[in-house]
């Protein structure tokens, strides 16, 4: 028979979990793990199960996004009696199993973190020997990726009536505050667009009317750092063009 269950227990246990006759399926994961972009994170996951001393074939799986249906980011399989879980899938080669599934530990290391990794992850184990059973974390662990600001685009664009406007887009977590400085501007917070749908870490600030030639600097700052980039506006007076 095959059973798919959802867990009710999802608290981080720091101790290794071993089966006893009365144990049921459960998974222990922390609600959230935080790490900086570019660094590594560990997604802890331990489990208990009712199949005492199970040493048959098993598969360990991690998904992203949603339980049961989300895309797999990691999968490994251990043969009967083997302590080695052979990796079959590691998305972009950045997911590595730290735990030993034979010791009820599916903990995963994620390397070279990017802001796009900021999502929820779900661990799952499948037994496929004499016993056929499987279990998956329902609530999962949220990986919160933080990042110092990075300006991803800065540009000057034409606007109606031979005027020009400047756009600055930056990413970071927490989302950075943007400020423009330049000729006759002082420090201006400008018009900041809220993060775009599906681009939660991107913030854009617009300077709607550039009235003077010269250097315009966009500064992005959050609690982890700051970044700045500049554009230059030189208009050919008497003509409708500009050099930036």
């Amino acid at each position: 028979f095959v059973r798919t269950k959802i867990d009710t227990t999802e608290n981080l246990l720091n101790t290794e979990v071993h089966s006893s006759p009365a144990q049921r399926w459960s998974m222990q994961v922390p609600p959230e793990v935080s790490a900086e972009a570019g660094d590594a994170a560990v997604l802890p996951c331990t489990f208990t199960h009712p199949h005492r001393h199970y040493d048959g074939p098993l598969t360990a799986i991690w998904r992203a996004g949603e339980p049961y249906a989300g895309p797999q980011v990691f999968r490994c399989a251990a043969a009967r009696g083997s302590e080695l879980c052979q990796t079959a899938l590691s998305l972009h080669g950045r997911f590595r199993l730290l735990g030993n599934p034979r010791r009820n530990d599916l903990s995963l290391r994620v390397e070279r973190l990017a802001l796009a990794d900021d999502r929820r992850y779900f661990c799952r184990v499948e037994f496929a020997g004499d016993v056929h059973d499987r279990y998956e974390s329902r609530h999962g662990v949220r990986l919160h990726v933080t990042a110092a600001p990075r300006i991803v685009n800065i540009s000057v664009l034409p606007s109606p009536a031979h005027a020009f406007r400047a756009l600055c887009t930056a990413e970071g977590e927490p989302p950075p505050a943007l400020a423009w400085s330049g000729p006759a501007l002082g420090n201006s917070l400008a018009a900041v667009r809220s993060p775009r749908e599906g681009h939660g870490h991107l913030v854009t600030a617009e300077l709607p009317a550039l009235t003077h030639d010269g250097r315009y600097t966009c500064t992005a700052a959050n609690s982890l750092g700051r970044s700045e980039a500049s554009v230059y506006l030189f208009r050919f007076h008497g003509a409708s063009g500009a050099s930036t």
């Epitope: 560990v42 990796t87 730290l98």
Partner: antibody
Framework: EVQILETGGGLVKPGGSLRLSCATS????????MNWVRQAPEKGLEWVAQ??????????FYAESLEGRVTISRDDSESSVYLQVSSLRAEDTAIYYC????????????WGQGVMVTVSL | DIVLTQSPALAVSLGQRATISCRAS??????????IHWYQQKPGQQPRLLIY???NLASGIPARFSGSGSGTDFTLTINPVQADDIATYFC????????TFAGGTKLELR
Amino acid sequence: EVQILETGGGLVKPGGSLRLSCATSGFNFNDYFMNWVRQAPEKGLEWVAQIRNKIYTYATFYAESLEGRVTISRDDSESSVYLQVSSLRAEDTAIYYCTRSLTGGDYFDYWGQGVMVTVSL
Amino acid sequence: DIVLTQSPALAVSLGQRATISCRASQSVTISGYSFIHWYQQKPGQQPRLLIYRASNLASGIPARFSGSGSGTDFTLTINPVQADDIATYFCQQSRKSPWTFAGGTKLELR
């Protein structure tokens, strides 16, 4: 029984190059990452390079102090790993060990007996 | 790079407890996992893995060896010390690349 055997060491002149080889047996080579670690005479250990396996796209990593002068490679069909070192300097004189590591951990669970490389006029 | 520091030598008596320390220049622990590993090296031999991830005994290593610690401070304990344990002991970190070793602690008989 896991066996790791390094060859290719010897005396090399400064500025020269050499290729170290590491033959393995007793385990499924494809399932592991392979590394080179060196130890200068009467000194500590220094990690040199790592090559991951096929699932991990044969990614390579190098110690900054050697970047650009070393290349690690592997041949899964031969269960072997290689280290090419160029522009050799006196400070590259060391015992070079070939080591195995699990895909989940950058620690070295098996080591070869090492091969001596001496860089001298 | 993460710098690991060990004291160069430790004198012990046979049958006693030996405690070898390793200090990291920054934390090597993430979410309860400590990326510190211990090796033993005898003269003329290759190193041998003793402990991985701070406290896990490697295959075939006697139970008199144990490891502990978290964050930046780690300890390898040998209890009781036997004559066969006279060697140099190295810690290594894999928290961040490049993976680095400490200079080693030479265990000597008092």
